[in-house]
Structures are given as structure tokens and as C-alpha cells.
Interface confidence: medium
């Protein structure tokens, strides 16, 4: 014999204060799967956390944090303060970047530094943990003949990356 | 959506081994360590180790050091807890948990482990 | 390794009434790696307070943490039915982590 509660499709909970008719989810709950005798309370997003995907009938909130903080943990059930600049998060808590990478942001990896010989330039302006390098002229722009020096070119625009 | 999935429960004869698996989805599970904690029945929580998936650093408590190996498959997103020689008191649900450097945060549903002959 | 007593095992309480749990440890542990986990019959274990005052996300703001030291408490300040629950106070300081024995709490 088949259970009637099978029936019930994601987004509702068989009732069996009403023989076990499939009633909606009551307002902030859900069911994300079908045949549920209840529906679970929406997680809600307070504080230090904010929400990022509301809840619906059939699916969770979803939470991340506050600027100037974030998430720790799968499904970021904790907030945390960034780290500094010329760090990154990593599962062991805020890192230095490793010698050759670098991070402008409080957030985000650590990514290398750019590598000016590869445009034919040189090192104008060495990188940090902070910063990355500043390309200067080629070396040929630099010789004691030439007629013009060539302006650094800009810092590539950093990356943003998600958490 | 963030999950671990436990393996099905297992019944086991006493001096046989048995192994769990956790696989991860939602996320990489080289980002977090994986811990496996157990729970006897009407009991509390015990930790056994944890395993950083991303180099395969292991840390075991002493009691369950030559009883419990940690493994992962990265290319599967997947943890394992491998016990050896299951007496009566080895039966428990036990859970794997993802964690950063200070707290366990999500758990898989559990697995159930019954030792008997 | 670091003994967490919990106190009481188990207690009732009314609804709407204030409720605090105890958490003692054999020595001293930082408060951020000092946590709680709720867990009901048939469910995993979730995360609840995290270093040691800190909501996790979707726990309501009736619920606080305090303590520093070996000394630490959970508090309910209206006791509702969903409350009904194991509480584990657990620490990370130090290898290897420990969990307390869990105080149940129960509905008068």
C-alpha cells in the first residue's frame, strides 16, 4: 500500500491533522524535498549576518555577513572580521601571502605578482605582500641611445574574488 | 545547497572492519578540514580525528590512534574513516563535520554502526 | 586533555521562562574556541554559539553565550518549545577537542 504522504510535493508537508492532505509550507518554513510530514523553519539572516537568498517554499535562506566581516565555515554559519591586506583566509585563519603574491583587499586570495618580463618590461617598482610590482620601461627604453622613456604602466586592476 | 552525505548504516560482526564515507558537495572540499566524531547510544560526542583534504595532514585522539584511519579522495569530494577491530563498544552513529582552524561547523547526517555477532 | 563538565544533565523548563546552562572546563580555554552545538533526537548536531558569545546563523536572539576562563554559559531568555534539545559546550584550545557531556533540557 502506497503512502499517501509520497505524494506530497517539495514546498508542502502532509497534514495528518487532515488526512494526510498535502498543505503548503505556513509562512517562513519550507520542505526542500517531496513526502515530508513537516516543514523545516527558515534559517533566518540577523546581526552580524545578512541574507543573500531568501527563503522560499521549497528552499533555505541563505546568509553571508556584514561588510567588514566573512564567512567561516560551509553554508557561513559563522562571521568573522576580514583580514588585513597582504593576507588571505585560509581554513587556518588569516595568512601572510606567500613571498611572490600579494592582496590590496581584506578579502580575497593572494594572487602573483605580475610578471613585467613577460611584456618585455622591467621592475619599477618592487611588489609587497601589499601591492603588486610596478612595471617600469623595457630594458632597450632604458639605454644610454634612447630617445624617449616609455610611462610605467599602470598596476593590473585587481581581481575580485569570491570567498 | 551545502551538504555532506554520510554512507548507509552498517551491521558488523565483532573483529571485522568497516568503512564510512562523507562526500561534500556545495563546496571544495579541500577548504575545510573534515573531522569525524562518534556518538554512542545515549551518549555524547567523541572526537576521533580530522583530515586536512588539501595535504593530508591527520591528527587523531589518542584513543582512537591505532583504531581509525582518515583517507580522502579530492577528485571525489569525498572523506573516509576507515575502523578496525569492531567490539560491542564501537557501535555509534558517527558523524563527519567540516571545520576551519577553531570550530566544527557542518555536520553530515550521521552514520550508524551496529557491532554484533 | 580538557574535561568539560556540563551542568545540569538534564532540566525542565516553562515556557516563557529564563533558562541557564553551565559549562565547566578542567582548565582554562580561550573563549573563541569555546562553542555550543544544539542537537535533537534523530538530528545531527548544529552549531549554535560559536566562540563563545556568537549566534550562529539562523539561531534566534533569544538565545546568549558568556563565559571566559574555565567558566561558561548558554542562556534561553524565554524558554519556547523548539528550544527542547540536548546542548553540548565543546573546546578546540587544545588537542586533542573535547565535548561536554550535554545538558538536556526538557519542557515542564
Known amino acids: 500500500l502506497q503512502d499517501p504522504c509520497s505524494n506530497c510535493p517539495a514546498g508542502t508537508f502532509c497534514d495528518n491533522n487532515r488526512n494526510q492532505i498535502c498543505s503548503p509550507c505556513p509562512p517562513n518554513s519550507f520542505s526542500s524535498a517531496g513526502g515530508q510530514r513537516t516543514c523545516d523553519i527558515c534559517r533566518q539572516c540577523k546581526g552580524v549576518f545578512r541574507t543573500r537568498k531568501e527563503c522560499s517554499s521549497t528552499s533555505n535562506a541563505e546568509c553571508d555577513c556584514t561588510p567588514g566581516f566573512h564567512c567561516l565555515g560551509a553554508g557561513c554559519s559563522m562571521c568573522e572580521q576580514d583580514c588585513k591586506q597582504g593576507q588571505e583566509l585560509t581554513k587556518k585563519g588569516c595568512k601572510d601571502c606567500c613571498f611572490g603574491t600579494f592582496n590590496d583587499q581584506k578579502r580575497g586570495i593572494c594572487r602573483p605578482w605580475t610578471n613585467c618580463s613577460l611584456d618585455g618590461k622591467s621592475v619599477l617598482v618592487n611588489g609587497t605582500k601589499e601591492r603588486d610590482v610596478v612595471c617600469g620601461p623595457s630594458p632597450a627604453d632604458l639605454s644610454p641611445g634612447a630617445s624617449s622613456v616609455t610611462p610605467p604602466a599602470p598596476a593590473r586592476e585587481p581581481g575580485h574574488s569570491p570567498q | 545547497e551545502v551538504q555532506l552525505q554520510q554512507s548507509g548504516a552498517e551491521l558488523v560482526r565483532p573483529g571485522a572492519s568497516v568503512k564510512l564515507s562523507c562526500t561534500a558537495s556545495g563546496f571544495n572540499i579541500k577548504d575545510y578540514y573534515i573531522h569525524w566524531v562518534n556518538q554512542r547510544p545515549e551518549q555524547g560526542l567523541e572526537w576521533i580525528g580530522r583530515i586536512d583534504p588539501e595535504d593530508g595532514d591527520i591528527a587523531y585522539a589518542p584513543k582512537f590512534q591505532d583504531k581509525a584511519t582518515l583517507t580522502v579522495d579530492t577528485s571525489s569530494n569525498t572523506a573516509y574513516l576507515h575502523i578496525i577491530g569492531l567490539t560491542s563498544e564501537d557501535t555509534a552513529v558517527y558523524y563527519c563535520t567540516t571545520g576551519n582552524y577553531y570550530a566544527m561547523d557542518f555536520w553530515g547526517q550521521g552514520t550508524s554502526v551496529t557491532v554484533s555477532s | 586533555q580538557i574535561v568539560l563538565t556540563q551542568s545540569p544533565a538534564i532540566m525542565s523548563a516553562s515556557l516563557g521562562e529564563r533558562v541557564t546552562m553551565t559549562c565547566t572546563a578542567s582548565?582554562?580555554?580561550?573563549?573563541?574556541?569555546l562553542h555550543w552545538y544544539q542537537q535533537k533526537p534523530g538530528s545531527s548536531p548544529k552549531l549554535w554559539i560559536y566562540?563563545?558569545?556568537n549566534l550562529a546563523s539562523g539561531v534566534p536572539a533569544r538565545f546568549s553565550g558568556s563565559g571566559s576562563g574555565t567558566s561558561y554559559s548558554l542562556t534561553i531568555s524565554s524558554m519556547e518549545a523548539e528550544d527542547a534539545a540536548t546542548y553540548y559546550c565543546?573546546?578546540?584550545?587544545?588537542?586533542?577537542?573535547?565535548f561536554g557531556s550535554g545538558t538536556k533540557l526538557e519542557i515542564k
Open positions: 565543546h573546546q578546540y584550545h587544545r588537542s586533542p577537542p573535547t
Open positions: 582548565s582554562s580555554v580561550s573563549s573563541s574556541y
Open positions: 566562540s563563545t558569545s
